[in-house]
């Protein structure tokens, strides 16, 4: 609404920078051939670029990325008993961000 | 993959808690009848519950919510000239979170 402005503080832009986000560890990352297992933990924290830029021609993009392998447990239930296996999932953390020009879509040839 | 576990640190669960997220200020929040304007800032930071819980029957939900009015600018370009107006948008911040049981979907009657 355009009224009752007195108590409203000025909105500050969410600048383009890294923020902590939650990444769900998909079972497909662990094993594409089998669905009868659980992954622990089901989600982890990652650093990702977010926020917005001054105009629509630029987007908040990572300029530096780091791959981080983490160890998870793959828990299979075999004859009602859990079998634990260790698996490595590679997470992608964004280390630095920048408002970058969005490349115009190339014409399909 | 199930190999090269030596350098992988144990994955830590992204616990259910408030995290800073980016909220895009939709133009529909300001004016549903007119599309010929910009909103500044286009996005702001909000606090939101995220993370995961111990099992699938529970979800990370806010237990305490606060509404926060903020002042944005509605920018119309009329005959190549900007006209600024002030508008208030009410943001929702999550103050506290909890892993809560997911209520079973009620049967449609």
């Amino acid at each position: 609404s355009l009224g009752s402005l007195t108590i409203a503080e000025p909105a500050m832009i969410a600048e383009c920078k890294t923020r902590t986000e939650v990444f769900e560890i998909s079972r497909r990352l662990i094993d594409r051939t089998n669905a009868n297992f659980l992954v622990w933990p089901p989600c982890v924290e990652v650093q990702r670029c977010s926020g917005c830029c001054n105009n629509r021609n630029v987007q908040c993009r990572p300029t530096q990325v780091q791959l981080r392998p983490v160890q998870v447990r793959k828990i299979e239930i075999v004859r009602k008993k859990p079998i634990f296996k260790k698996a490595t999932v590679t997470l992608e953390d964004h280390l630095a961000c920048k408002c970058e020009t969005v490349a115009a879509a190339r014409p399909v040839t | 993959s199930l190999g090269s576990l030596t350098i992988a640190e144990p994955a830590m669960i992204a616990e259910c808690k408030t995290r800073t997220e980016v909220f895009e200020i939709s133009r529909r929040l300001i004016d549903r009848t007119n599309a010929n304007f910009l909103v500044w800032p286009p996005c702001v930071e909000v606090q939101r519950c995220s993370g995961c819980c111990n099992n699938r029957n529970v979800q990370c939900r806010p237990t305490q919510v606060q509404l926060r009015p903020v002042q944005v600018r509605k920018i119309e370009i009329v005959r190549k000239k900007p006209i600024f107006k002030k508008a208030t948008v009410t943001l929702e911040d999550h103050l506290a979170c909890k892993c809560e049981t997911v209520a079973a979907a009620r049967p449609v009657t």
Epitope: N55 | R79, F84, K85
Partner: antibody, heavy 123, light 106 residues
Framework: EVKLQQSGDELVRPGASVKMSCKAS????????MHWVKQSPGQGLEWIGT????????SYNQKFKGKATLTADKSSNTAYMELSRLTSEDSAVYYC????????????????WGQGASVTVSS | NIQLTQSPSLLSASVGDRVTLSCKGS??????LAWYQQKLGEAPKLLIY???NLQTGIPSRFSGCGSGTDYTLTISSLHSEDLATYYC????????FGAGTKLELK
């Protein structure tokens, strides 16, 4: 007190470029629009273009497109104008001036001006 | 583009005189007209905006009126410090200035 402080006078060679600044103080930089105006020796005033610092959007007088480039730095409350491929025709005093984009009675009026920056193009 | 024609281009007057400066637009300006005073070596100074609104800090001897294409600036009693060049400025459609009226001592 509203103040627009412009950079100093410039003596430049033909074909060169010059970038001048206009530092704003005494008001909220992003709540106003910045204009640039040219005044040739003994002549009247000519509007060059406008920048909306809040959203980094520019508008130019057709005559100055390709000649002037307007930018703004919100962090330092400073507007800039770069003039390229200078000729003797560009020798003039250049002013920055602000206008309010809020639709009140004083909307769009240049109510505060910089002191002016003289550019002399000479070989 | 709207053109503004100011008349006269040079006006000689004495201290205490009532002075009237004219500005004519090539099309309707819808009252979006302002007047500026410029002294030698100085930046223009806003006197009147939206045809007849006196800018804060400007003496009340300055007044403006007009509509459509025809506008005037009046100085009810000329002071020596009023000797300057006066420009009209339209901001209804784009931005244009008149060529100016130079006010000098008779």
């Amino acid at each position: 007190e509203v103040k627009l402080q412009q950079s100093g006078d410039e003596l430049v060679r033909p074909g060169a470029s010059v970038k001048m600044s206009c530092k704003a103080s005494g008001y909220t930089f992003t709540d106003y629009v910045m204009h640039w105006v040219k005044q040739s020796p003994g002549q009247g005033l000519e509007w060059i273009g406008t920048i909306i610092p809040l959203i980094d959007t520019t508008s130019y007088n057709q005559k100055f497109k390709g000649k002037a480039t307007l930018t703004a730095d919100k962090s330092s409350n400073t507007a800039y104008m770069e003039l390229s491929r200078l000729t003797s025709e560009d020798s003039a005093v250049y002013y920055c001036a602000r206008t309010s984009p809020y639709y009140y009675s004083s909307y769009d009026v240049m109510d505060a001006w910089g002191q002016g920056a003289s550019v002399t193009v000479s070989s | 583009n709207i053109q503004l024609t100011q008349s006269p281009s040079l006006l000689s007057a004495s201290v205490g005189d009532r002075v009237t400066l004219s500005c004519k637009g090539s099309q309707n300006i819808n009252n979006y007209l302002a007047w500026y005073q410029q002294k030698l070596g100085e930046a223009p100074k806003l006197l009147i905006y939206k045809t007849n609104n006196l800018q804060t800090g400007i003496p009340s001897r300055f007044s403006g009126c007009g509509s459509g294409t025809d506008y005037t600036l009046t100085i009810s009693s000329l002071h020596s410090e009023d000797l300057a060049t006066y420009y009209c400025y339209q901001y209804d459609n784009g931005y244009t200035f008149g060529a100016g009226t130079k006010l000098e001592l008779k």
